[in-house]
Interface confidence: low
């Protein structure tokens, strides 16, 4: 467990043209926050995605009006850290979203408004215990100045905060199998404490905070035995001893919601469902009214005057979730066949079809030939959304309305001249030369060269050519 | 060629049910959005609704709780079916084609069959 | 989605260069088309995706914008151009028409 820490030193105009105008004015006097989200590993999800490692909200400014004719100064910001609590190990490497937000102060209807200024983004590698990082990132004309760290909580140590020291029972060694914690040699690694109500006789852990069960024993904390009467569960590998399914740690096995949350099982983790008041990937932010600004993506703060009532987000189309944290991404069901573009609305689902594909969701191969005739004896051959004639001989162009010269290929060889013929071509060959395209030299003694010329016909007489 | 041709009743008491039929001649019946779109006299367009020849419908939610399309693909056939009407739903009704996967261009109309609702 | 359509009429002569403007009330990429309707007529198909000339449509006519922000233009007005024109937005449903322009004779 840890702290990822940020310190935002400056938000306003990059360097070079174009200064952006300030976002306050004497008529909407406004006042800066901003947000931080952290996902593990060097992930390019989209920003909505959920902030697995955590989220944090930054209190409000100073209040900020421009004067009338200056350029956007650096804009006054809030005191202290951005704090986000991590309960699990530090991954070292962690993807983050830094978001500017302005909230306008001006006679809004309904409260405050709030509208996102900038949004940065970045992946870096860090490693816990380590000093300030500085950066500097632009969206667009702004500029963001800030600093970071991850800092391990006692009485956890390392770069990934995963091995736990306690100070020495004894001045002169530690416990049996414990080693002295570099680099705190007056301190000892504790043994690894699992979830809190592990079975010590049927669990076991390898990370702080798991419970990893013994065969035979199942539960969030392995107290359960594995039943061989019943096999029933829905989940989990074949137990070879009983021939069940024996039940595999689910997710939301022991409800990591707190708080009253809802657990939901994703193809790849969990996600809670918070009651109001509540928010964080475990539900574990509390005490939030609409003065901290809880409503993500636009969405609009109602009630929750203090601590003790709820607040209600009013989510913008095309965001859910009790902060309006989630994008509804129905596209990542992939529901468009055929190559075809999907478009989430918000209110509907469109597919944008590739050429020949047609359908709302471009299920169909588009009847190419329909209502396409080929002309003189053609026959219509579909690909790819467009359609082609393959043409009788002596016909061409695309509906084989266009009477071929069968000649214009030159197809005559060695000086042969060409005639168009009804069925075809003829080709009249020089001395010399024979075949349908005169393409065989005729041989000195008089005799042709394979295949030969057929009874009847003299080398050089004109050979049709069928 | 493609040819849209309508028909249905032209004129209604309130509170009963519109119904309009349109053919579709010439070309595919499958790759489409088969489209009703109304005007009233001497006003602008609205747009009712759609259907896919595999039965997929959208709805004008101003419309949605009065509003049914259905399709017969056997007869290249498309229905509208609008309940409860007043004299407000007096219009031109229009049906037509709109293309996939480039805009619902509509790119083929029905002549138009004027509703009159009147008691 | 509304369709703001300007102006609602206009009347110019034959050779004048029209332009008409439709502006959405939120972001709608470049799902915009454009129709003629003449009296007792079904409208006729102009321009789709914003720019697109619509196959047997003239030249004269062209269509240009992207996001909120659209233009029909005639570049050269023909007595057959005395008409009624409407935009219409295909990016969500409901697709919606603009209230219209009616172009009359000067």
């Known amino acids: 467990a840890g702290v990822f820490e940020l310190q935002i030193h400056s938000f306003g105009p990059g360097p070079g043209p174009g200064a952006p105008r300030s976002p306050c004015s004497a008529r909407l006097p406004c006042r800066l926050f901003f947000r931080v989200c952290l996902k593990p590993g060097l992930s390019e999800e989209a920003a909505e995605s959920p902030c697995a490692l955590g989220a944090a909200l930054s209190a409000r400014g100073p209040v900020y009006t421009e004067q009338p004719g200056a350029p956007a100064p650096d804009l006054p910001l809030p005191d202290g850290l951005l704090q986000v609590p991590f309960r699990d190990a530090w991954p070292g490497t962690f993807s983050f979203i830094i978001e500017t937000w302005r909230e306008e102060l001006g006679d809004q209807i309904g409260g405050p408004a709030w509208s996102l200024l900038a949004r940065v983004a970045g992946r870096r590698r860090l490693a816990a215990g380590g000093p300030w990082a500085r950066d500097i990132q632009r969206a667009g004309a702004w500029e963001l100045r800030f600093s970071y760290r991850a800092r391990c909580e006692p009485p956890a140590v390392g770069t990934a905060c995963t091995r736990l020291c306690r100070p020495r029972s004894a001045p002169s060694r530690c416990g049996p199998g414990l080693r002295p914690c570099a680099p705190l040699e007056d301190e000892c690694e504790a043994p690894l404490v699992c979830r809190a109500g592990c079975s010590p006789e049927h669990g076991f852990c390898e990370q702080p905070g798991e419970c990893r069960c013994l065969e035979g024993w199942t539960g969030p904390l392995c107290t359960v035995p594995v039943s061989t009467s019943s096999c029933l569960s829905p989940r989990g590998p074949s137990s070879a001893t009983t021939g069940c399914l024996v039940p595999g740690p689910g997710p939301c096995d022991g409800n990591p919601c707190a708080n009253g949350g809802s657990c939901s099982e994703t193809p790849r983790s969990f996600e809670c469902t918070c009651p109001r008041g509540f928010y964080g990937l475990r539900c574990e932010v509390s005490g939030v009214t609409c003065a901290d600004g809880p409503c993500f993506n636009g969405g609009l703060c109602v009630g929750g005057a203090d601590p003790d009532s709820a607040y209600i987000c009013h989510c913008p189309p095309g965001f859910q979730g009790s902060n309006c944290e989630k994008r509804v991404d129905r596209c990542s069901l992939q529901p468009c066949r055929n190559g075809g573009l999907c478009l989430d609305l918000g209110h509907a689902l469109r597919c944008r079809c590739r050429a020949g594909f047609a359908g709302p969701r471009c299920e169909h191969d588009l009847d190419d030939c329909a209502g396409r005739a080929c002309a003189n004896g053609g026959t219509c051959v579909e690909g790819g959304g467009a359609h082609r004639c393959s043409c009788a001989l002596g016909f061409g162009g695309r509906d084989c309305r266009e009477r071929a010269d069968p000649c214009a290929a030159r197809p005559c060889a060695h000086g042969g001249r060409c005639y168009a013929h009804f069925s075809g071509l003829v080709c009249a060959c020089a001395p010399g030369y024979m075949g349908a395209r005169c393409e065989f030299p005729v041989h000195p003694d008089g005799a042709s060269a394979l295949p030969a010329a057929p009874p009847g016909l003299r080398p050089g007489d004109p050979q049709r050519y069928l | 060629q493609v040819q849209l041709q309508q028909w249905g009743a032209g004129l209604l008491k309130p509170s009963e049910t519109l119904s309009l039929t349109c053919a579709v001649y010439g070309g595919s019946f499958s790759g489409y959005y088969w489209t009703w779109i109304r005007q009233p006299p001497g006003k602008g367009l609205e747009w009712i609704g759609e259907?896919?020849?595999?039965?997929?419908?959208n709805y004008n939610p101003s419309l949605k709780s009065r509003v049914s399309i259905s399709v017969d693909t056997s007869k290249n056939q498309f229905s509208l079916k609008l309940s409860s009407v007043t004299a407000a739903d007096t219009a031109v009704y229009y049906c037509a084609r709109g293309e996939y996967g480039s805009g619902s261009r509509f790119d083929y109309w029905g002549q138009g069959t004027l509703v009159t609702v009147s008691s | 989605i509304q369709m703001t359509q300007s102006p609602s009429s206009l009347s110019a002569s034959v050779g004048d260069r029209v332009a008409i403007t439709c502006r959405a009330s939120q972001g709608i990429r470049d799902d915009l088309g454009w129709y003629q309707q003449k009296p007792g007529k079904a409208p006729k198909l102009l321009i789709y995706a914003a720019s697109s000339l619509q196959s047997g449509v003239p030249s004269r006519f062209s269509g240009s914008g992207s996001d909120t922000d659209f233009t029909l233009t005639i570049s050269s007005l023909q007595p057959e151009d005395f008409a009624t024109y409407y935009c219409?937005?295909?990016?969500?449903?409901?697709?919606?028409f603009g209230g219209g322009t009616k172009v009359e004779i000067k």
């Open positions: 259907i896919t020849h595999s039965g997929s419908t």
């Open positions: 219409l937005q295909d990016y969500d449903y409901p697709l919606t």
